[in-house]
Interface confidence: low
C-alpha cells in the first residue's frame, strides 16, 4: 500500500465474527523469526474517542516539548499488543472477543479477530508486526453493516397469500450474487426460479404460499470483494402444520 493509496476496506456484519486480515510479506531471511514475532494492533474509531485510553497506551509515545503540544490526540488506541512470548496487553480490560490466532501467528498471519464485531469497532486499523530488527505494517478500514430480511406484507400469512422477501445488507454497492435457500432437516436446499418462486436480485416473490412454506428461509449475499453475509427469516403461514 503506497502512501496516499486507498486504505483497503474490510466489511463485517454487526454481531458476527470479523477478521481483520494482516499477512505482510516477510522476507525469507526473517521467516525463522516468526515464532518470536510480536504484533501491535491500533484502532482509530470512526466516531468519538474510545471510552478510556489506558495508561499503557499513553506511555508508549514520545514526550511533548511543552504542554501546549499535547492537544486532543490521540483518539487512536492500542487494541491488542502481543509480545514475542505471547504476552498480551492493550486497552483495559482486555476483552476476550479480541483475538489473535496463535497458530496463524507462527505462519505469518497476524489477523485480528473480533468475535463478535460491534458498531463501535468501525474505523481504521493499523498493525505493526515486530520482527527482530524490523517491523512490517498492515492498514485497513473496517466498515460494519446490518443485515436484515423483511417480508412484505409482514407478519403471519394465510394459505394462498403472496409475500415478497427482501434480503439486504447496509452497504452502498450491490451484491455480486444473491443465493436463496431453505433450511430443512437435512441442511440447506437451494431455492430455484419456478412458478412458486420468482427471484429478482435481492427479492424473492412467492405468489401463493402454503403451510409447507412455513419455516426458515435464508439468503446469502456475496460481494465483489468476497465478503458474504447469510440472513435468515422465519416465515409463518397459518394452516395445517407442514409434515416434519
Amino acid at each position: 500500500l503506497q502512501p496516499g493509496a486507498e486504505v483497503p476496506v474490510v466489511w463485517a456484519q454487526e454481531g458476527a465474527p470479523a477478521q481483520l486480515p494482516c499477512s505482510p510479506t516477510i522476507p525469507l531471511q526473517d521467516l525463522s523469526l516468526l515464532r518470536r514475532a510480536g504484533v501491535t494492533w491500533q484502532h482509530q474509531p470512526d466516531s468519538g474517542p474510545p471510552a478510556s485510553i489506558p495508561a499503557l497506551d499513553l506511555l508508549q509515545g514520545p514526550h511533548p516539548a511543552a504542554p501546549s503540544s499535547w492537544g486532543p490526540r490521540p483518539r487512536r488506541y492500542t487494541v491488542l499488543s502481543v509480545g514475542p512470548g505471547g504476552l498480551r496487553s492493550g486497552r483495559l480490560p482486555l476483552q476476550p472477543r479480541v483475538q489473535l490466532d496463535e497458530r496463524g501467528r507462527q505462519r505469518g498471519d497476524f489477523s485480528l479477530w473480533l468475535r463478535p464485531a460491534r458498531r463501535a469497532d468501525a474505523g481504521e486499523y493499523r498493525a505493526a508486526v515486530h520482527l527482530r530488527d524490523r517491523a512490517l505494517s498492515c492498514r485497513l478500514r473496517l466498515r460494519l453493516g446490518q443485515a436484515s430480511m423483511t417480508a412484505s406484507p409482514p407478519g403471519s400469512l394465510r394459505a394462498s397469500d403472496w409475500v415478497i422477501l427482501n434480503c439486504s445488507f447496509s452497504r452502498p454497492d450491490r451484491p455480486a450474487s444473491v443465493h436463496w435457500f431453505r433450511n430443512r432437516g437435512q441442511g440447506r436446499v437451494p431455492v430455484r426460479e419456478s412458478p412458486h418462486h420468482h427471484l429478482a436480485e435481492s427479492f424473492l416473490f412467492l405468489p401463493q404460499v402454503s403451510p409447507m412454506d412455513s419455516g426458515p428461509w435464508g439468503c446469502i449475499l456475496t460481494y465483489r470483494d468476497g465478503f458474504n453475509v447469510s440472513i435468515m427469516y422465519n416465515l409463518t403461514v397459518l394452516g395445517l402444520e407442514p409434515p416434519t
Epitope: 491500533q42 482509530q44 514520545p62 511533548p64 486532543p72 490526540r73 517491523a135
Partner: antibody, heavy 124, light 106 residues
C-alpha cells in the same frame, strides 16, 4: 483515495505575508485523529518542518519560525492554511502540506501522505 | 532543538550494491525516527517509521535500525528506482529533518 492539494500565490513581495491553503480530499479532517502539517524545502536544500494543526485548532510550530507562523483549519471546507509573515528571500521554497501520522506514538509523528508541493518565490 | 546529522551527504553506488545511510541525533530520540525517499520534483515518500517499521507497500530491501542517537537506513540491493535523496526525521520533540543523502549512480 486521500489527496492533499496546496494552493496560493507563487510570488510574494518581501515583508508581506505568504498565505497558502491545503485542501484535503478523500477523508474528513474533523473525523480523523491526525495532525496536518506544513513543510518547506528551499531550492536545492533540505526539508524544514513549519508546524502542524489538529482539527480542533490545536497547533504546534517550529520554534525558529513560531513568531511569524499561523496555521489555521476550516473543517467546513476540509482545508487548513498557512500564513507566514514578514517574508524575505530566505523563505523562497517549495511548500508542502502533509498528514502527520502518529501511529504507535502519542504526540508527534511522521508524514505519511504529502501534497505535490507549490513553489513560492519571495521577490520584489 | 534536536539536530539531525546525516552522512554521507552524497553516495555513489551501483545497482545491486548494499547501501547504508547514517543519521545521528544531537540527543536521544528513543526510536522516534522516520526515513523518507525523495525524487527530483516530487514530494518525499515515507519509507520507515519508528526507526525500523516499514510503511505498508515499501519493498523489503529497505530496512531501518538503531535507537537513541544513532540510526541507519539500509538498502540491501540497490535497484534503478532507488537513486534518489533520502532524509531522516526525528519526532521525539517537535520535528526536525536531517540534511539529506543523495544516492547517485557510480
Amino acid at each position: 483515495q486521500l489527496q492533499l492539494q496546496e494552493s496560493g500565490p507563487g510570488l510574494v513581495k518581501p515583508s508581506e505575508t505568504l498565505s497558502l491553503t491545503c485542501t484535503v480530499s478523500g477523508d474528513s479532517i474533523s473525523s480523523s485523529s491526525y495532525y496536518w502539517g506544513w513543510i518547506r524545502q528551499p531550492p536545492g536544500k533540505g526539508l524544514e518542518w513549519i508546524g502542524s494543526i489538529f482539527y480542533s485548532g490545536n497547533t504546534y510550530y517550529n520554534p525558529s519560525l513560531k513568531s511569524r507562523v499561523t496555521i489555521s483549519v476550516d473543517t467546513s471546507k476540509n482545508q487548513f492554511s498557512l500564513k507566514l509573515s514578514s517574508v524575505t528571500a530566505a523563505d523562497t521554497a517549495v511548500y508542502y502540506c502533509a498528514r502527520e501520522d502518529d501511529f504507535l506514538t502519542d504526540y508527534y509523528g511522521a508524514f505519511d501522505i504529502w501534497g505535490q508541493g507549490t513553489m513560492v518565490t519571495v521577490s520584489s | 532543538d534536536i539536530q539531525m546529522t546525516q552522512s554521507p551527504s552524497t553516495l555513489s553506488a551501483s545497482v545491486g550494491d548494499r547501501v547504508t545511510i547514517t543519521c545521528r541525533a544531537s540527543q536521544s530520540i528513543s526510536s522516534w525516527l522516520a526515513w523518507y525517499q525523495q525524487k527530483p520534483g516530487k514530494a518525499p515518500k515515507l519509507l520507515i517509521y519508528k526507526a525500523s517499521s516499514s510503511e505498508s507497500g515499501v519493498p523489503s530491501r529497505f530496512s531501518g535500525s538503531g535507537s537513541g542517537t544513532e540510526f541507519t537506513l539500509t538498502i540491501s540491493s540497490l535497484q534503478p528506482d532507488d537513486f534518489a535523496t533520502y532524509y531522516c526525521q526525528q519526532y521525539n520533540s517537535y520535528l526536525t529533518f536531517g540534511g539529506g543523502t543523495k544516492v547517485e549512480i557510480k
